[in-house]
Amino acid sequence: SIPWNLERIIPAWHQTEEDRSPDGSSQVEVYLLDTSIQGAHREIEGRVTITDFNSVPEEDGTRFHRQASKCDSHGTHLAGVVSGRDAGVAKGTSLHSLRVLNCQGKGTVSGTLIGLEFIRKSQLIQPSGPLVVLLPLAGGYSRILNAACRHLARTGVVLVAAAGNFRDDACLYSPASAPEVITVGATNAQDQPVTLGTLGTNFGRCVDLFAPGKDIIGASSDCSTCFMSQSGTSQAAAHVAGIVARMLSREPTLTLAELRQRLIHFSTKDVINMAWFPEDQQVLTPNLVATLPPSTHETGGQLLCRTVWSAHSGPTRTATATARCAPEEELLSCSSFSRSGRRRGDWIEAIGGQQVCKALNAFGGEGVYAVARCCLVPRANCSIHNTPAARAGLETHVHCHQKDHVLTGCSFHWEVEDLSVRRQPALRSRRQPGQCVGHQAASVYASCCHAPGLECKIKEHGISGPSEQVTVACEAGWTLTGCNVLPGASLTLGAYSVDNLCVARVHDTARADRTSGEATVAAAICCRSRPSAKASWVQ
Amino acid sequence: QDEDGDYEELMLALPSQEDGLADEAAHVATATFRRCSKEAWRLPGTYIVVLMEETQRLQIEQTAHRLQTRAARRGYVIKVLHIFYDLFPGFLVKMSSDLLGLALKLPHVEYIEEDSFVFAQ
């Protein structure tokens, strides 16, 4: 009778497995920035170092009674979820607690910053094994808190944060909105988003994945053997921090980018009922529930990709949206999406030495999203080939002309504002393998990569009849790197990747006007990495 | 996950009204002031002064000291609560909001953020 949350995130084959680093000792250290904790609790006793760090605001109210067990409640529970002997995810992982939240669970951005700096100082004074920082707290969007998380992440520390319990867009909160943080939303025993009173888990593009966060049994600070259930995105984040600690125990050299990609790749997909989220957030919110991934030794050199959505561009005529990959990741393709369908396409450009995915709004449009496909491609050498728009009626062809480079994605960007005059671009997988083909007034961008054993192919699926969307999936063993819509009708909303599925969205009115001869096609570029093979295009 | 969320950013590029000091008069604020969009979560009176990324250790201390000196000239007492060296260059200061215009004009300042609450989730 294992608690539901542990059963959910730890597959059967891991249940009895002890995660140890190659030299036999678990050297991962988790830092918890939260309330004070009860270190003598049976679950965590001997595993927790209560640092002397304390940076909290005064409690509100003149009649506030500071009761130790209440002051310790939140932190003790989370420490138990991470490393508790009996109900913890990473049983036995050593944990350091820093007090940044007072007895009422309130802290400050400045106190959190000083806490993060304390961790950095500790790291400099006494370098150790991998560090995981758990941030089970949230405040309003803070540029400096996000920046501090970015700086700490760049030193090799893995930060895991609660998405927030405000039933709102996580991008409006910090540290949840920091791209370098693994941001975790909460689900219940039925894998549904957690409701907390009138509120609930946050959602949106700033959430990386979900994890158990409802009725989680863990250490209670009421007594040294007490347990209680608590709910929230803090509990969800604690599960992921525990998973990360276990992953790093086995493989201490895993980077933040690898950890995030593996968490996403091995999570349980499509079990969350997305109808719980506001309609405009459904496409942006990942349908992923965390599970402990197998080690890299068991899974080989799989090509891992994730989808990164930009912020909404806003409705102005020249509004652009920008989606960025993490520094270690390769941007293999860029697409765009607009709810009104009024967009001028997408392209890849270099900003400050990094390739970014950009999308442009069209006149009368309500705004666009840029959708980047970010992948881990060992020893990759990627470049962008682009061709300016062709003269009226002519096609523009772009292919990967360097030896051993394969096409991983295509982008199209229209110079003209008038949506009615242009015929939309296409990918050609037959007569001209590995080419992006654009039509009238479209600039075409081909993303070309060389990496040992990288091979790619195009897979298309078209629907002639009325349909709001067309999808095409890459088969097992292949990973979706590029996704485009090749429309028969004039107006498409765009295309984006959901895990290994390429989704092409069509405007309702276009769907109604369409004649049977004009198929809307979802075109996917599917790649795989076979380290022994050389780069190739598969027809 | 981008640079700016639902965030209040106020440009306080006020013309210098200092005591005729050349370096002060010449420096027009390009730094911005930021604060939490949720008013109830704000902590007015405490500010995180964030300096440009390449700012050296000594310059951080000098900037904090310069702010104290200039504030004192105007009859304000400010308290530097913490200096950040290791994660980013900057300092935490307790001061009147009247001094924000002055602080934004200091050399090396990239932006100033008003402190705000965070909550257990």
Partner: antibody, heavy 126, light 106 residues
Framework: QLQLQESGPGLVKPSETLSLTCTVS??????????WGWIRQPPGKGLEWIGS???????YYNPSLKSRVTISVDTSKNQFSLKLSSVTAADTAVYYC??????????????????WGQGTLVTVSS | EIVLTQSPATLSLSPGERATLSCRAS??????LAWYQQKPGQAPRLLIY???NRATGIPARFSGSGSGTDFTLTISSLEPEDFAVYYC????????FGGGTKVEIK
């Protein structure tokens, strides 16, 4: 009905290690619902908790005895055992084994020692 | 560690009388206190847990009360089989037992 039975030598020499085993019948030591504990009672005195262990290998000891105590659970034999090293005459006592709810599974009942074995007297003497 | 002090050390009463046993903790144990009964040559038996809840099979004449630092075990009308030693135990911080109260026949 769950029953616990202590067994082991009744006489141990000073500085040696006291070893006792508790055999569980009518239930399983590998249940996630319970800890398995040892409590002792010197002749004519009160009770003292020694420590508790979980099927997974988790242990939890009285701080005053921690350096000398080892409790382990053998799920294959449905037993748990106590080892107390470097014994002195002060360790002479009746040693009881008992079950304690782990708290991990709230429905398992109160988080106290219940039931107990009938106890075994161990005398430390040369 | 939390020290539990039981009083009186010995209580001499007749069958049918009311017995009131006290247990005082050196610091608050909230309601994390239990009472056990031990008869000569037998193991202790759980009577009351979490200060006031009767364990399975325990007669209604046994009741517990209190929270924080002061607790009471009451036996409303003593039966012959109730004459024994009674121990309190806390689990707020680790596990400690009181020194015991012996209830003997007057």
């Amino acid at each position: 009905q769950l029953q616990l039975q202590e067994s082991g030598p009744g006489l141990v020499k000073p500085s040696e290690t006291l070893s006792l085993t508790c055999t569980v019948s009518g239930g399983s030591v590998s249940s996630s619902s319970y800890y398995w504990g040892w409590i002792r009672q010197p002749p004519g005195k009160g009770l003292e908790w020694i420590g508790s262990a979980y099927y997974s290998g988790s242990t939890y000891y009285n701080p005053s005895l921690k350096s000398r105590v080892t409790i382990s659970v053998d799920t294959s034999k449905n037993q748990f055992s106590l080892k107390l090293s470097s014994v002195t005459a002060a360790d002479t006592a009746v040693y009881y084994c008992a079950r304690e709810n782990s708290g991990v599974v709230p429905a398992a009942g109160p988080n106290w020692f219940d039931p107990w074995g009938q106890g075994t007297l161990v005398t430390v003497s040369s | 560690e939390i020290v539990l002090t039981q009083s009186p050390a010995t209580l001499s009463l007749s069958p049918g009388e009311r017995a009131t046993l006290s247990c005082r903790a050196s610091q608050s144990v909230s309601s994390y206190l239990a009472w056990y009964q031990q008869k000569p040559g037998q193991a202790p038996r759980l009577l009351i847990y979490d200060a006031s809840n009767r364990a399975t099979g325990i007669p209604a004449r046994f009741s517990g009360s209190g929270s924080g630092t002061d607790f009471t075990l009451t036996i409303s009308s003593l039966e012959p089989e109730d004459f024994a030693v009674y121990y309190c135990q806390q689990r707020r911080n680790w596990f400690t037992f009181g020194g015991g109260t012996k209830v003997e026949i007057k």
